[in-house]
């Protein structure tokens, strides 16, 4: 039985040209996290973090994505095209798969403030 819940940074906004941290956290389960996958709204993989083997950043994002902090992901040099949904998928044993959603809005405005909060989707 899957008892865990994914907490995410929820809906966030960040300035064009800036950077943003995408964070998910799995709680309320003793399941072992074997892998965390980060994906973009169009089903493109940004990165994979295998618990034992480490990080891989996918080719389309290798210049703009940095692993961490923790199991999170830092997206840099933001463009307007980065606006949209991002998903963290936690592969766990023995529970199975947990998925969290983050919505990122990239703002043109130079006064846009980065807002982030943890929330349960």
């Amino acid at each position: 039985m899957m008892t865990g819940t994914i907490e995410t940074t929820g809906n966030i906004s960040a300035k064009k040209g800036g950077s943003v941290i995408l964070q998910c956290h799995l709680s309320s389960t003793m399941a072992q996290v074997t892998q965390v996958n980060w994906e973009q709204h169009d089903h493109s993989l940004l990165a994979i973090r295998n618990a034992e083997l480490g990080w891989h950043i996918y080719p389309a994002f290798k210049d703009r994505v940095a692993p961490g902090p923790g199991l999170g992901l830092t997206l840099q040099s933001l463009t307007m095209n980065d606006t949209g949904e991002y998903f963290c998928t936690y592969h766990t044993y023995p529970d199975g798969t947990y998925r969290g959603r983050i919505f990122l809005e990239v703002l043109e405005s130079s006064v846009a403030e980065h807002s982030a909060r943890f929330q349960i989707p």
Epitope: Q35, N37, L45, E52, G54
Partner: antibody, heavy 119, light 107 residues
Framework: EVQLQQSGPELVKPGASVKISCKTS????????MHWVKQSHGKSLEWIGG????????SYNQRFKDRATLTVDKSSSTAYMELRSLTSEDSAVYYC????????????WGQGTLVTVSA | DIVMTQSHKFMSTSVGDRVSITCKAS??????VAWYQQKPGQSPKLLIY???YRYTGVPDRFTGSGSGTDFTFTISSVQAEDLAVYYC?????????FGGGTKLEIK
Amino acid sequence: EVQLQQSGPELVKPGASVKISCKTSGSTFTEYTMHWVKQSHGKSLEWIGGLNPNNGGTSYNQRFKDRATLTVDKSSSTAYMELRSLTSEDSAVYYCTRGTYYDYSFAYWGQGTLVTVSA
Amino acid sequence: DIVMTQSHKFMSTSVGDRVSITCKASHYVSTAVAWYQQKPGQSPKLLIYSPSYRYTGVPDRFTGSGSGTDFTFTISSVQAEDLAVYYCHQHYSTPWTFGGGTKLEIK
């Protein structure tokens, strides 16, 4: 040029163990994950597990977890796979292979080591 | 475990033809798919990764596409040296798995 050189063929008895080596040359050994893949005669490929040479971290296919052990000797740029309690089902070619920079696809492969389990 | 199904075990084609090999995942695998070529008596060779990037030195007649659960590998103009078995491979979720292979035969 990156090369993965595997040890030679093995003929082993049922119940015994085998340890296969894979020496990397032509690149920094610790930069990439190393993996082992099984190919039974005329069959497809089966991932056994992978290893991070930097920290010795291992990820196993649950099917092999109890019988396979992946290790590494950084000083000689060599990865090892030990397989225990062998049966005829383990007769196969075993490949070591190296991950790419970008993802967990396998860019370089050893020549394969044929393991035959027979009484 | 995620099962990668290559519906055709064999495909027969002629030199110069265009041929497409399909691979279907039993569960969602995003874009974590690669394609390998294995010629008789040789080790597999990476052709396509992620799943539309050509690996270094791979001729541009080889292409890949797809995301989610459905993937396609295409040879735009088959050459005699393309006689081989082609495998798809997912690394979205461990254990990473391979398709059963499609053997390309030249008429």
